[in-house]
Amino acid sequence: APVRSLNCTLRDSQQKSLVMSGPYELKALHLQGQDMEQQVVFSMSFVQGEESNDKIPVALGLKEKNLYLSCVLKDDKPTLQLESVDPKNYPKKKMEKRFVFNKIEINNKLEFESAQFPNWYISTSQAENMPVFLGGTKGGQDITDFTMQFVSS
């Protein structure tokens, strides 16, 4: 079945942008001016997910790349990774659970909770130039709130 998708950028609540750091990692840092063109453009898709009051299940792919954010166990710890997929088959309505994030919107701020690992969130560090990761705490030092901006083609 076809899915509703959009193109967007994400910034954390400290206004750090997300950029590629090597082929399979994202990092967060402050960008200005022309450097803003470095930020990753996501293709966010509305997918099938479990019932929950005001959580909306989405998948986060990298626009025009066959890479999706996914959540897997590594050394017994929930971990965020960029995973290659077959572009002929993605995005799809029934994404595998590791690709699904519950988007939670509160006061124009977005959180992305892993569907595979409840209460684990896409997170950034306070420090500059650090990897985007899956964090198991909210409201602590690490940042779990993001803002979204559509990207004009």
Epitope: F46, E51, D54
Partner: antibody, heavy 119, light 108 residues
Framework: EVQLVESGGGLVQPGGSLRLSCTVS????????MSWVRQAPGKGLEWIGI???????YYASWAKGRFTISKDTSKNTLYLQMNSLRAEDTAVYFC?????????????WGQGTTVTVSS | DIVMTQSPSTLSASVGDRVTITCQAS??????LSWYQQKPGKAPKLLIY???TLASGVPSRFSGSGSGAEFTLTISSLQPDDFATYYC??????????FGQGTKLEIK
Amino acid sequence: EVQLVESGGGLVQPGGSLRLSCTVSGFSLSSYAMSWVRQAPGKGLEWIGIIYDSASTYYASWAKGRFTISKDTSKNTLYLQMNSLRAEDTAVYFCARERQIFSGDMDGWGQGTTVTVSS
Amino acid sequence: DIVMTQSPSTLSASVGDRVTITCQASQSISSYLSWYQQKPGKAPKLLIYRASTLASGVPSRFSGSGSGAEFTLTISSLQPDDFATYYCQNTGGGINIAFGQGTKLEIK
């Protein structure tokens, strides 16, 4: 305060074209999706389509081809281009804001602009 | 496309009555259903989203229930301000967003 104001309605001949506008304030079109919905006289609500970014628009099957949704974020304005108009397109046209991305429901509406297709 | 069917089309009731409006989807839409109220000459107003969550500022006499393909809107004790037309809306069943045909709630 969230406000949406439609304009551009009026009388148009069958086969003609019309572009409706919806100017918004109190929020940004760069982070909210917008729909157009219409209501023929004495009839129910009919969803036309929705726009996210300028490359991501989705339409009701009956609207594809004749109706085009676009926006100018810098002007806080949403548009509905309607071509090859027919008598059955006579309706009040509303713009509406999606409450959250992909929520599908609409928490802010304009007052509507009336389009009459008649010779 | 998913088709939304409301019943009844018209409902006559009195102030203080408990009323229920039903909405059926042609296939499962999980809990992706909203309800709107519309008064003559006005824009619709969001009442309930995700089948059962009350929108901001909506009185608690309104409630929604259901999932899958069967949904209901209940007004526990009708007030004079509640006489209007009510619409259900599929908000998540694929690409298309669809409204029911409406239920007109009128004074008996």
